[in-house]
């Protein structure tokens, strides 16, 4: 099942997804997609970067943080209804079928009409690289599996520093990190 | 310390190829992360990205103007070099040779600049 | 491409006076690579502001970087002679590269 995110009609959304890189430089492409992630690439491709930078993008959408180092969280400017769904973020790990995946689920609530920021936006603001495994029990490791030459780790940061936080308890799984090298 | 330092025929004629060289010492391009780019400014004018190296040989060009240049490098002697062919007069500018990290900073060393001239 | 619209071109401002510079991207970009030079006449650029807020090794506390997404500021919170120069903005996020065309800053 698909990680679920919240925005209102006017906001910005923020989706997050992030990898480690091996070494200064090593980057590994990323394409963001709208619809769940296929066998291979992404679908409806609304951004990409490749070994060095964005080399792809459409008019909304951009990665706001810093891609060299593994921050690919896509962020969606003024969104509308029509940007409710399933989005992709792809970690295109070299060799065959050893992508990650990860399926985010956007879901745009109408704007209030007396604006009053919402729990949720003052997390998303306090804490844009938030990033936890599923489930809020204590951080934890997962090796989710072993390739030449490249270790991949779902870690789960900052974890510590929330689970005793009153937000912690309005958080959904929040992102997915993976580490190479 | 960081150096680089831009060379250049100073003038040349239309049609020509213009070769660059930077020399760069203090910091090596077998480095991962590093990178040397090339940058040019008309007199009086703005900005404008040519052309980066990157330690592992990655290159990346200005769309504009990638059918006519070429960047290549020389780790061991601590050089980069750009060709641009086919010049005319919109290419006469003082070029600039950067340094480029790819995770911290960027550009945070130039070279002095060397002036080049297209005149028939 | 990104194009990076500076403005204003040039300005003209007291000793003292709060001066901001403003740069607008036609896309987003990533924050980490939105960087300011600062240039004189018959010199180098000079790196001054990188990651949108940090400033370069040497650079007075005076100046101050902000910005998001497609809107991006240099701010002088009390400008001085020294700061008399032409300013450029620059984005290496999404390729191809680009810099602003630039804000001349003069001293009345």
């Known amino acids: 099942s698909e990680v679920e995110y919240r925005a209102e009609v006017g906001q910005n959304a923020y989706l997050p997804c992030f990898y480690t890189p091996a070494a200064p430089g090593n980057l590994v492409p990323v394409c963001w997609g709208k619809g769940a992630c296929p066998v291979f690439e992404c679908g409806n491709v609304v951004l990409r970067t490749d070994e060095r930078d964005v080399n792809y993008w459409t008019s909304r959408y951009w990665l706001n943080g810093d891609f060299r180092k593994g921050d690919v969280s896509l962020t969606i400017e003024n969104v509308t209804l029509a940007d409710s769904g399933i989005y992709c973020c792809r970690i295109q790990i070299p060799g065959i079928m050893n992508d990650e995946k990860f399926n985010l689920k956007l879901v745009i609530k109408p704007a209030k009409v007396t604006p009053a920021p919402t729990r949720q936006r003052d997390f998303t603001a306090a804490f844009p690289r938030m990033l936890t495994t599923r489930g809020h029990g204590p951080a934890e490791t997962q090796t989710l599996g072993s390739l030449p030459d490249i270790n991949l780790t779902q870690i789960s940061t900052l974890a510590n520093e929330l689970r005793d936080s009153r937000l912690a308890n309005d958080l959904r799984d929040s992102g997915a990190t993976i580490r190479i090298g | 310390q960081v150096t680089l330092k831009e060379s250049g025929p100073g003038i040349l004629q239309p049609s020509q190829t213009l070769s660059l060289t930077c020399s760069f010492s203090g910091f090596s391009l077998s480095t991962s992360g590093m990178g040397v780019g090339w940058i040019r400014q008309p007199s009086g004018k703005g900005l404008e990205w040519l052309a980066h190296?990157?330690?592992?040989?990655?290159?990346r060009y200005n769309p504009a103007l990638k059918s006519r240049l070429t960047i290549s490098k020389d780790t061991s002697s601590s050089q980069v070099f750009l060709k641009i062919a086919s010049v005319d007069t919109a290419d006469t500018a003082t070029y600039y040779c950067?340094?480029?990290?790819?995770?911290?900073?960027?550009?945070?060393?130039w070279g002095q600049g060397t002036s080049v001239t297209v005149s028939s | 491409q990104i194009v990076l619209t500076q403005s204003p071109t040039i300005m003209s401002a007291s000793p003292g006076e709060k001066v901001t510079l403003t740069c607008s991207a036609s896309?987003?970009?990533?924050?980490?690579?939105l960087y300011w030079y600062q240039q004189k006449p018959g010199s180098s650029p000079k790196l001054w502001i990188y990651?949108?807020?940090n400033l370069a090794s040497g650079v007075p506390a005076r100046f101050s970087g902000s910005g998001s997404g497609t809107s991006y500021s240099l701010t002088i919170s009390s400008l001085e002679a020294e700061d008399a120069a032409s300013y450029f903005c620059?984005?290496?996020?999404?390729?191809?590269?680009?810099f602003g065309g630039g804000t001349k800053l003069e001293i009345k």
């Open positions: 990651g949108t807020s």
């Open positions: 896309s987003g970009i990533s924050s980490s690579y």
């Open positions: 950067v340094r480029t990290f790819i995770t911290t900073t960027t550009m945070d060393y």
């Open positions: 620059h984005q290496w996020s999404n390729y191809p590269y680009t």
């Open positions: 190296i990157w330690w592992d040989d990655v290159k």
